[in-house]
């Protein structure tokens, strides 16, 4: 990545790290308004299976692992990228390494959910306070989950699907911060590990993933009012370990693995027409990216 200053533009879709033959250190940003990609400052350490989020206009890269020819190291790292300076800086590490982690943000705090360290599959969850640069454990999930999809809706944290070390999961659970407790919610129609999970228009969407047999292109959404999961239009590509985010009322899915190929495809879902369209390609195929959108 280049080390020059990043252009000061509006909302960009950032994609950090990922995997293709080895873990990657790329940071790239897609501008949906003009279809261009920016090459930004590399992560200080390559990583895949990480998660991305934005707090206070800063991009955070959380967990993952560095799978390289020299070895394989799960990461407890939290790194912060400032779009104004195009620079990364390390923050306080998590209590444990978490590969294939999920993250969500509530009230400016980052929740790191599940993930793995070697063959240990975590049910633990910890919360980061940026103003103190501190992590603190909160209540553990009811289920061990790696490849977990995490989303926040109405100040509640949802953990969806994943892999518990024995089975891929269709179960989902919800964390109530005020009570510091988890409760199971309605299970998805489909087993999904490594799915993309996000919130759009008061619904939680789960896109793609892996059911223990095959990569999926199906997509379903959870209505918190009716507590039901309903299928919507499928993606054009089957994919697991994909990146996902929401930009201006549309869902974007980035990359992933289809069982044979590392995808460069980026698809966009329009809820008004219930359709997916190919909008761009990443500069190279990859899985296990961390994705987030800058605030305006």
């Amino acid at each position: 990545g280049s080390m020059g200053h990043a252009p000061k533009v509006g909302r960009l879709i950032y994609t950090a790290g990922g995997y293709f033959r080895q873990s990657l250190s790329y940071l790239e940003a897609y501008n949906p308004s003009d279809g261009t990609w920016l090459d930004l400052a590399d992560l200080q350490v390559p990583r895949s299976g990480l998660a991305g989020c934005v707090v206070g206009g800063l991009l955070y890269a959380v967990g993952g692992r560095n799978n390289s020819p020299d070895g394989n190291t799960d990461s407890s790292a939290l790194d912060c990228y400032n779009p104004m300076t195009n620079q990364w800086s390390p923050c306080a590490p998590m209590s444990v390494p978490r590969n294939r982690i999920g993250v969500g943000v509530i009230d400016g705090h980052i929740y790191a959910v599940g993930g793995s360290h070697g063959c240990i599959h975590h049910n633990s969850v910890e919360r980061y306070e940026p103003e103190r640069d501190e992590w603190h454990l909160v209540a553990p999930m009811l289920t061990r989950r790696i490849g977990v999809g995490v989303a926040v809706l109405n100040r509640l944290l949802y953990a969806v699907g994943g892999f518990d070390g024995t089975n891929r999961l269709n179960s989902a659970e919800c964390y109530y911060p005020e009570r510091n407790e988890w409760r199971m919610i309605t299970a998805m129609n489909t087993i999904r590990s490594g799915a993309g999970v996000c919130v759009l228009h008061n619904c939680i969407y789960a896109a793609g993933g892996y059911d223990g047999q095959d990569q999926l292109n199906s997509v379903e959404r959870y209505d918190v009012e009716t507590e039901t999961w309903t299928f919507v239009a499928p993606m054009k590509h089957r994919r697991s370990a994909l990146g996902i985010t929401v930009h201006q009322g549309r869902i974007y899915v980035l990359g992933g693995y289809d069982g044979h190929t590392f995808l460069d495809s980026v698809e966009c879902y329009d809820p008004d027409t219930d359709t997916w369209s190919e909008v761009t390609r990443m500069t190279s195929g990859r899985s296990g990216v961390g994705v987030a959108v800058t605030m305006e």
Epitope: Y19, R21, S48, G49, N67, G71, N72, R100, G118, C119, I120, G147, F163, G165, T166, N167, S193, G194, Y210, G212, Q213, D214, Q215, S240, A241, Y257, G259, F262, S287, G288
Partner: antibody
């Protein structure tokens, strides 16, 4: 019947290349992690490489990293080990194995019969 | 890398004997240890996974146990078909490593 059958072994000169195949039947390789394990003549077992069916990520022993490539073709239900820059110390019987986590917590519960690779001038 | 030190390297026993083979991990591997049986010219066969779980179809005379970083394979009553080489393997962390093997021979 659940089965793995390796092929592609043989005699090759130092610096040469071979591609081993591992054909699966009775199960889908997309549902399992696939591993290659080797055994030098009269020696013990050595893990070589693995591929994860969910993320596509691969892992290699340091002794082969950068020279060997594991891959899988789900349409052919076959896994491969591309071996380049072969050395005398790569001489071994190469086994393909699978682990299905729901069966045996990452332990390799199905093995092929092995294929012999001899690296010699 | 995690070393799996297996002992003894060989042993002689008679049919009906109780046989114990030990693997010591150089650091914690939780319970992520498997045991395999291999006969000459054949592929290994899984006996025990997760330190103590008997794999399906394996006779109940085989058992596994864990005490900290020490792992034990026990054959309660050795049968003629059990004469083979046995390997432990840790899959707790990359790279997966095997013990050097224990050859069980007829006394």
């Amino acid at each position: 019947e659940v089965q793995l059958v390796e092929s592609g072994g043989g005699l090759v000169q130092p610096g040469g290349s071979l591609r081993l195949s591992c054909a699966a039947s009775g199960f889908a390789i997309s549902a399992s992690s696939i591993h290659w394990v080797r055994q030098a003549p009269g020696k013990g077992l050595e893990w070589v490489a693995s591929i994860d069916p969910e993320t596509g990520e691969t892992l290699y022993a340091k002794s082969v990293a950068g020279r060997f490539t594991i891959s899988a073709d789900t349409s052919k239900n076959t896994a491969y080990l591309q071996m380049n820059s072969l050395r005398a110390e790569d001489t071994a019987v190469y086994y393909c194995a699978r682990s299905a986590a729901s069966d045996a917590a990452y332990a390799a519960n199905v093995w092929g019969q092995g294929t012999l690779v001899t690296v010699s001038s | 890398d995690i070393q799996m030190t297996q002992s003894p390297s060989s042993l002689s026993a008679s049919v009906g004997d109780r046989v114990t083979i030990t693997c010591r991990a150089s650091q914690s591997v939780s319970s992520a240890v498997a045991w395999y049986q291999q006969k000459p010219g054949k592929a290994p066969k899984l006996l025990i996974y997760s330190a103590s779980s008997l794999y399906s179809g394996v006779p109940s005379r085989f058992s596994g146990s864990r005490s900290g970083t020490d792992f034990t394979l026990t054959i309660s009553s050795l049968q003629p078909e059990d004469f083979a080489t046995y390997y432990c393997q840790q899959s707790y962390s990359f790279p997966s490593t095997f013990g050097q093997g224990t050859k069980v021979e007829i006394k």
